[in-house]
Amino acid sequence: SQVSNLLKQQQTNLTHQKNKLEGQISARQQAEEASQESQNELKEMIETLAWKLNEKSKEQMELHHQNLNLQETLKRVANCSAPCPQDWIWHEENCYLFSTGSFNWEKSQEKCLSLDAKLLKINSTADLDFIQQAISYSSFPFWMGLSRRNPSYPWLWEDGSPLMPHLFRIRGAVSQTYPSGTCAYIQRGAVYAENCILAAFSICQKKANLRAQ
Amino acid sequence: SQVSNLLKQQQTNLTHQKNKLEGQISARQQAEEASQESQNELKEMIETLAWKLNEKSKEQMELHHQNLNLQETLKRVANCSAPCPQDWIWHEENCYLFSTGSFNWEKSQEKCLSLDAKLLKINSTADLDFIQQAISYSSFPFWMGLSRRNPSYPWLWEDGSPLMPHLFRIRGAVSQTYPSGTCAYIQRGAVYAENCILAAFSICQKKANLRAQ
């Protein structure tokens, strides 16, 4: 019974020590994890700093080019988050670019495609109002993405959808047949049909990048 | 005796567990020391890199202000929301709005102010090139933020800064005196002086929002 008590007392001491050690291990484990996390942060910081240092060196090497590159670099970097690229107009869900050169309809279409866009498509009276306002200070014609093969065919947008009849009346060469087809342009707020081979300004359009930042 | 044996056995187990835990603690202590050493090395590396980076920055600060601008702009652009409001054109560091109504110079100035902007200011040949291109499809005149009281006064921008003489030549009514002053407009790429009371389109300009979010 005395032996038993002694053994029980020792057992209690050992259990207490064991618990204490386990607590220490747990604390050290947490500290280790925190230390690991801190190390990872430091490594990340090093990576970031190393990257920044590398960037700075590169920048220094290319200083005489940077004035030229300012525009391009800004365009590239900012396109990620800006709704529209530089020089485009952002309106509601779309970006619009008014061409600065005169080309035939097909060439104008190619120019838009090269910018990952299409020629202007008017879906609503609101779209039409915006475009009419945007070109209000120009007396020039602008090709839009509307064409037809000949007068017996319907007017179609580039995506193949038909023109909604209530949107606008097409004036001009509506009854004409041309080998290159008949294309629509907008000028001073009105839409006209003309031979697609004529050179005119144009309006490119693409979806605005409205993803959440 | 049976109880004693059971207690002895438990004691042996506890002693074994205690020794094992002490061993673990010792191992963790060594790992922690090594980790601390590694962290110190990493911190030293960070300090070195940070110092190097600081040196590079100092070197770069002496370089042309446009090159520094690129760096800053790129940093700012990295995570922007829309650089410009809807219907404005974003170009480099500015937003531009081409008015859709004709007003005299003062009224045009007020319209821009109400949009938290100012009338167009041309700081460089690059700015001039962009504006000339942007209005290439218009034959109309556009007021800019440049005016003077009479021919004996210098041409001043709205912010009070003088016109850089190499930028462009002002044609038209340069020697005229008008009660409302003489204002500058741009038309088909050339800049003209005219009576400020005349109604014309205008171009508003404000800084693009290139701050990081």
Epitope: N104, S139, F140, P141, R171, G172, A173, S175, Q176, T177, Y178, P179, S180, Y185, Q187, R188, A190, Y192, A193, E194, N195, I197, L198, A199, A200 | -
Partner: antibody
Framework: QVQLLESGGGLVQPGGSLRLSCAAS????????LHWVRQAPGKGLEWVSV????????YYADSVKGRFTISRDNSKNTLYLQMNSLRAEDTAVYYC????????????WGQGTLVTVSS | QSVLTQPPSVSGAPGQRVTISCSGS????????VSWYQQLPGTAPKLLIH???HRPSGVPDRFSGSKSGTSASLAITGLQAEDEADYYC???????????FGGGTKLTVLG
């Protein structure tokens, strides 16, 4: 019915100016492109200029470029040709002609007005 | 010197068939439609054929137009005395961005 009536022709000295007009009636003026075509005495037809419905497309023959200006006033149903720095070789009957498309055929013609450039 | 080339003159007896040729290039006749005009002495030209082969209302079916490559032609069958006139072909030249006429062909009805 469709009518095109030219006026403004006459005798003018070399280097002088003249403004021709063409008054239109019997059709929706702004739905048609309009041309000036001339014919020197005893010669063939020579195209001079064309203007589209709202004046967005304007083209000239090389022989008159920089000297002649075509314009239209849709509110007055009138086409104009401002002729400056006139030369002896500009002497001709000037016709205005209507076209349903800028690059298509001339389906109606005026009776013409004679311009004589001589000293 | 006209951009489009026509023979200066053709002739035929009443009731005969005559053709007037009009030669151009790939930038005009080759890629665009051709129109033909008749000009009676002392009058303004009158549209005879448009879109290469279409006759406006009121033009007799004795007149027909056709095109092959960079050349076009006007055929008149059952020639009549009142057909005696000058005939002009016309097209649009997309390279020079202008209307081009032929030099004109004088048709004489013999007898």
């Amino acid at each position: 019915q469709v009518q095109l009536l030219e006026s403004g022709g006459g005798l003018v000295q070399p280097g002088g100016s003249l403004r021709l007009s063409c008054a239109a009636s019997g059709f929706t003026f702004s739905d048609y492109a309009l041309h000036w075509v001339r014919q020197a005495p005893g010669k063939g037809l020579e195209w001079v200029s064309v203007i589209s419905y709202q004046g967005g497309f304007i083209y000239y023959a090389d022989s008159v470029k920089g000297r002649f200006t075509i314009s239209r006033d849709n509110s007055k149903n009138t086409l104009y040709l401002q002729m400056n720095s006139l030369r002896a070789e500009d002497t001709a009957v000037y016709y205005c002609a209507r076209s349903p498309g800028l690059t298509s055929y001339h389906d109606s013609w005026g009776q013409g007005t004679l311009v004589t450039v001589s000293s | 010197q006209s951009v489009l080339t026509q023979p200066p003159s053709v002739s035929g007896a009443p009731g005969q068939r005559v053709t007037i040729s009009c030669s151009g290039s790939s930038s005009n006749i080759g890629s665009n439609y051709v129109s033909w005009y008749q000009q009676l002495p002392g009058t303004a030209p009158k549209l005879l054929i448009h879109s290469t082969s279409h006759r406006p209302s009121g033009v007799p079916d004795r007149f027909s137009g056709s095109k092959s490559g960079t050349s076009a032609s006007l055929a008149i069958t059952g020639l009549q005395a009142e057909d005696e006139a000058d005939y002009y072909c016309q097209s649009w030249d997309y390279e020079s961005e202008r209307v081009v006429f032929g030099g004109g062909t004088k048709l004489t009805v013999l007898g």
